[in-house]
């Protein structure tokens, strides 16, 4: 899938964690088929 960023947004993060995607893990592998 593709995500495009850079569109204007007024949302704010409610946590102190970065909003970037975490490091990939094999658990995130898409199901075959």
């Amino acid at each position: 899938s593709e995500t495009t960023t850079g569109t204007s947004s007024n949302s704010s993060q409610s946590t102190s964690n970065s909003g970037l995607a975490p490091n990939p893990t094999n658990a995130t592998t898409k199901a075959a088929g």
Epitope: E2, G6, S16, P24, T29, K30
Partner: antibody, heavy 118, light 107 residues
């Protein structure tokens, strides 16, 4: 030792396309997103986007969505960026960089110089 | 997008001196600012991440501070190899954005 080895300089004509490669070594290729960054005198550093090497999910900067295509070849631990419909404004140095969630862009390639000229 | 304003764009100093570079974000980025060093014929080097955490192998004369919108990079006791370009970059949200850079030159 983590290394990102990029392909060599490119001189292409306006309207053409180019594919830049970034071969990773010294770490588990699928464990980190691969990012791409453009450096030009006019705009300094601009983030193009990133790709998840496991799922091939991509996140793009809106500005580069129609310009860049990101792919990976897990068998060779290589990431690729294809740039199309090139103009003089695409002339720049392009970097691949590994992104770690905690540390951000912790390792960079040496850069690939792209010159678009007729 | 988060705009990053970096200053100064140019700085001249001598070995042994202490210098400070500033970056301001257009909105709060929590602690998520990184600093990089760029030198000719070398790959870009991550110095500091998450505002103040020193990357492994980076000398302790490099120090980052700040949170929210205002951040600083301080280099104490400048060494000859420290004269280079420095960039800040927010890693709080997409798209990642960079400051315009600071060129640190020998006075």
């Amino acid at each position: 030792e983590v290394q990102l080895q990029q392909s060599g300089p490119e001189l292409v004509k306006p309207g053409a396309s180019v594919k830049i490669s970034c071969k990773a070594s010294g770490y588990e290729f699928t464990g980190y997103h691969m990012n791409w960054v453009k450096q030009s005198p006019e705009k300094s550093l601009e983030w193009i986007g990133e790709i998840n090497p496991i799922t091939s999910d991509k996140t793009f900067n809106q500005k580069f969505k129609a310009k860049a295509t990101l792919t990976v070849d897990r068998s060779s631990s290589t990431a690729y960026m294809h740039l199309k419909s090139l103009t003089s404004e695409d002339s720049a140095v392009y970097y691949c960089a590994r992104r770690d969630y905690d540390t951000s862009l912790d390792y960079w390639g040496q850069g690939t110089t792209l010159t678009v000229s007729s | 997008d988060v705009q990053i304003t970096q200053s100064p764009s140019y700085l001249a100093a001598s070995p042994g001196e202490t210098i400070t570079i500033y970056c301001r974000a257009s909105k709060s980025i929590s602690k998520y600012l990184a600093w990089y060093q760029e030198k000719p014929e070398k790959t870009n080097r991550l110095l500091i991440y998450a505002g103040s955490t020193l990357q492994s192998g980076i000398p302790s004369r490099f120090r980052g501070s700040g949170s929210g919108k205002d951040f600083t990079l301080t280099v104490s006791g400048l060494e000859p190899e420290d004269f280079a370009m420095y960039y800040c970059q927010q890693h709080n949200e997409y798209p990642l954005t960079f400051g315009a850079g600071t060129k640190l030159e020998l006075k």
